[in-house]
């Protein structure tokens, strides 16, 4: 299975939600056989490797944050944790997953990573992560609301605050 | 605050079996895996191997998949090993770990000493 | 299976002193490695991971380096209470193996 990023870089000015998402795909067994574990955290561009380090998330962890299902299934963050924080992480059925962050700051500015780990039964895990670059602004160069910019050569996109 | 309670120390005699505890307090206890590690004196580290709890998925190390059997019981957030046929080679300090998936293992256990012993 | 090799069993080193623990894994690994160390009477507890990250809490005195399947765990400037043995990890593939262990002591 694959993630893909839709943006590769999110624009946005302070004081803005923003919802940064991930989508996972290719084969999904539908048995009991495999279950999904999905997260997010900051990281830095590695010499070795992007998303090799794990740093917290508004002092959230990869692992407060975490999915965890098997399938397609849609599931949610523990919302009073992260949304005590302005952060709520979900998934739907159709293996898109996003994290939202709520009033940015500059201090949110950054490399932020999805990650995604397959686990079978009696089967080393296969691990996946996309990787896209959060820059909050502030003062007259900012924009008015977030901008997303496609990890393809595609156009830019105004994205609605979540 | 995250942590792994083990049961206390066990001395056995040989041929008979033992059934040690980890108990987890201050996360998810099902989304994590419980790793089990064996540490005799001056041996070193070796991975039995672990259990996904909730679902269930084992990996055991080969050498020891007919030594030890894992278990876990959500209801108490609690995972337990067996280990069967007690011999001198079982003799040793098991640790509990815990590991999220994908990564290493970030808590510790402060370790079941068990002696097998006539 | 892989195979984690420390060269060195013991290390005698002095406070203040720099030293540097090998560990060579029997196949490419990429980065995926830690280093654990244990102190006397305790468990174990993770100092890097991903083969030169630390660990929440660890001080900046001890960095790790390599890649493939050669590594170096280091700790700049040793402190009495670094006396332990230290691990190195791999978590590429099932069954994870630990090298055999680098006692440092103080001289």
């Known amino acids: 299975f694959k993630v893909a990023t839709l943006y590769s870089l999110y624009v946005c000015p302070e004081g803005q939600n923003v919802t940064l998402t991930c989508r996972f795909f290719g084969p999904v067994d539908k048995g009991h056989d495999v279950t999904f574990y999905k997260t997010w955290y900051r990281s830095s561009r590695g010499e070795v490797q992007t998303c090799s380090e794990r740093r917290p998330i508004r002092n959230l962890t990869f692992q407060d944050l975490h999915l965890h299902h098997g399938g397609h299934q849609a599931a949610n963050t523990s919302h009073d944790l992260a949304q005590r924080h302005g952060l709520e992480s979900a998934s739907d059925h159709h293996g898109n997953f996003s994290i939202t962050m709520r009033n940015l700051t500059l201090l949110d500015s950054g490399l932020y990573c999805c990650l995604v780990v397959e686990i079978r039964h009696h089967h080393s895990e296969h691990r996946v992560h996309g990787a896209m670059e959060l820059q909050v602004q502030t003062g007259k160069d900012a924009p008015s609301s977030c901008v997303a910019y496609p990890s393809s050569s595609q156009e830019s996109e105004n994205i609605t605050a979540a | 605050q995250v942590q792994l309670q083990q049961s206390g120390a066990e001395l056995m005699k040989p041929g008979a079996s033992v059934k040690i505890s980890c108990t987890a307090t201050?996360?998810?206890?099902?989304?994590?895996?419980i790793e089990w590690v064996k540490q005799r004196p001056g041996h070193g580290l070796e991975w039995l191997g672990e259990?996904?709890?909730?679902?269930?998925?084992?990996n055991y190390n080969e050498k020891f998949k007919d030594k030890a059997t894992f278990t876990a019981d959500t209801s108490s957030d609690t995972a337990y090993m067996q280990l069967s046929s007690l011999t001198s080679e079982d003799s040793a300090v098991y640790y509990c770990?815990?590991?999220?998936?994908?990564?290493?293992?970030?808590?510790w256990g402060a370790g079941t000493a068990v002696t097998v012993s006539s | 299976d892989i195979v984690m090799t420390q060269s060195h069993k013991f290390m005698s080193t002095s406070v203040g002193d720099r030293v540097s623990i090998t560990c060579k894994a029997s196949?490419?690994?990429?980065?995926?490695i830690a280093w654990y160390q244990q102190k006397p009477g305790q468990s174990p507890k993770l100092l890097i991971y991903?083969?030169?990250y630390r660990f929440t809490g660890v001080p900046d005195r001890f960095t790790g380096s390599g890649s493939g399947t050669d590594f170096t765990f280091t700790i700049s400037s040793v402190q009495a209470e670094d006396l332990a043995v230290y691990y190195c990890?791999?978590?590429?593939?099932?069954?994870?193996?630990f090298g055999g262990g680098t006692k440092l002591d103080i001289k």
């Open positions: 770990a815990r590991r999220p998936p994908g990564w290493y293992f970030d808590v």
């Open positions: 201050g996360y998810t206890f099902s989304s994590c895996w």
């Open positions: 259990i996904l709890p909730g679902s269930d998925y084992t």
């Open positions: 196949q490419d690994v990429s980065t995926d």
């Open positions: 991903s083969a030169s």
């Open positions: 990890q791999h978590q590429y593939s099932t069954p994870w193996t």
